[in-house]
Interface confidence: low
């Protein structure tokens, strides 16, 4: 029996304490391998879970989550809220970004505008809860007599802090 | 389409065996199990045993335990279902059934009318 | 083995009315898998039983979604939402969990 259970291929199991040998998997279960002795449950996309791929006999259903919210962890196994451009999400709900930091999604957290004279440059665009700062020449670079050989640093697309 | 097609009817005296024979068409034959349940007049269905069509392997209900063999042809795509030492208590209506998935009965033969007289 | 009782026995029903068959099992035919392993068949007057219901829920192919099942471990039913004249018959319940396999008495349906 164990010989003829290794020939039972995905989409069955093998069930020697009943009738069948291989026996196709019962609706909403599937085997992905060969040989399985039970076939497992198909992954339900429930609630603030949509369907991204059915489940068949051979593969589990892929999940999604539901407009308003975006997925974590590893084959989407959570779905976290939404929530506005200049805010995070923290246990109480969704909070705005502090002053002085910003967050350009729907999801993550809020980080530091850019430090410009870190980089020897200065604030050309203030930055908001939305948006980081955009960096510009410095006050010498800009001042009469200043040499026009190395042209301004490009503005940074807005949104993009340094990790 | 799929079928299960049984042997006719059978008249046989107490003491004998009788053996219905159940032809299966538009499917693989040894990809599923085969049951007999049988029903006698008044009576509820009653479950015999099953057939593994691919290994031959049998399981029978322990209330007919000794009387009855179920076996199958391959190469014909058929089922077999002898029961010896009839009684009285033995007319009844005999089926054969494909189990599709998950002990569920999905295709059942026209059934055979066994009576047993004397 | 697992006894298998229906009630009630008999079911004289209106056209378009509902109807509701219950089945007890006296073991629980709930398999670790997560399905209930139970069955509903008809059996119309000099016919073979047909199949109607499976893994206590799923209908059948071809089985009109009039018919569905509910249930789970020991309790189980059938209902009908609107009752038709084909449904005419005997409904019996069967657990194919553990050899031997058993059936309920059946219950017969009639048109009033």
């Known amino acids: 029996l164990q010989d003829l259970c290794s020939n039972c291929p995905a989409g069955t199991f093998c069930d020697n304490n009943r009738s069948q040998i291989c026996s196709p998997c019962p609706p909403n279960s599937f085997s992905s391998a060969g040989g399985q002795r039970t076939c497992d449950i198909c992954r339900q996309c429930k609630g603030v879970f949509k369907t991204r791929k059915e489940c068949s006999s051979t593969s589990n259903a892929e999940c999604d989550c539901i407009s308003g919210y975006h997925c974590l962890g590893a084959e989407c196994s959570m779905c976290e809220q939404d929530c506005k451009q200049g805010q995070e999400l923290t246990k109480k709900g969704c909070k705005d970004c502090c002053f002085g930091t910003f967050n350009d999604q729907k999801r993550g957290i809020c980080r530091p505008w850019t430090n410009c004279s870190l980089d020897g440059k200065s604030v050309l665009v203030n930055g908001t809860k939305e948006r980081d700062v955009v960096c510009g020449p410095s006050p010498a670079d800009l001042s009469p007599g200043a040499s026009s050989a190395t042209p301004p640093a490009p503005a940074r697309e807005p949104g993009h802090s340094p990790q | 389409q799929v079928q299960l097609v049984q042997s006719g009817a059978e008249v046989k005296k107490p003491g004998a065996s009788v053996k219905v024979s159940c032809k299966a068409s538009g499917y693989t034959f040894t990809n599923y199990p085969m049951h007999w349940v049988r029903q006698a007049p008044g009576q509820r269905l009653e479950w015999m045993g099953w057939s593994n069509a691919g290994s031959g392997n049998t399981k029978y209900s322990q209330d007919f335990q000794g009387r009855v063999s179920i076996t199958r042809d391959t190469s014909a795509s058929t089922a077999y279902m002898e029961l010896s030492s009839l009684k009285s208590e033995d007319m009844a209506i005999y089926y054969c059934?494909?189990?599709?998935?998950?002990?569920?009965?999905?295709?059942w033969g026209q059934g055979t009318v066994v009576t047993v007289s004397s | 083995d697992i006894v298998m009782t229906q009630s009630p026995l008999s079911l004289p029903v209106t056209p378009g009315e509902p109807a509701s068959i219950s089945c007890r099992s006296s073991?629980?035919?709930?398999?670790?898998?997560?399905?209930?392993?139970l069955g509903w068949y008809l059996q119309k007057p000099g016919q073979s039983p047909q199949l109607l219901i499976y893994l206590g829920s799923h209908r059948a192919s071809g089985v009109p979604d009039r018919f569905s099942g509910s249930g789970s471990g020991t309790d189980f039913t059938l209902k009908i939402s609107r009752v038709e004249a084909e449904d005419v018959g005997v409904y019996y319940c069967m657990q194919p969990l553990q050899i031997p396999y058993t059936f309920g008495q059946g219950t017969k349906l009639e048109i009033k």
């Open positions: 073991q629980r035919l709930l398999h670790s898998n997560g399905f209930n392993y």
């Open positions: 059934a494909r189990e599709g998935v998950a002990g569920a009965f999905d295709i």
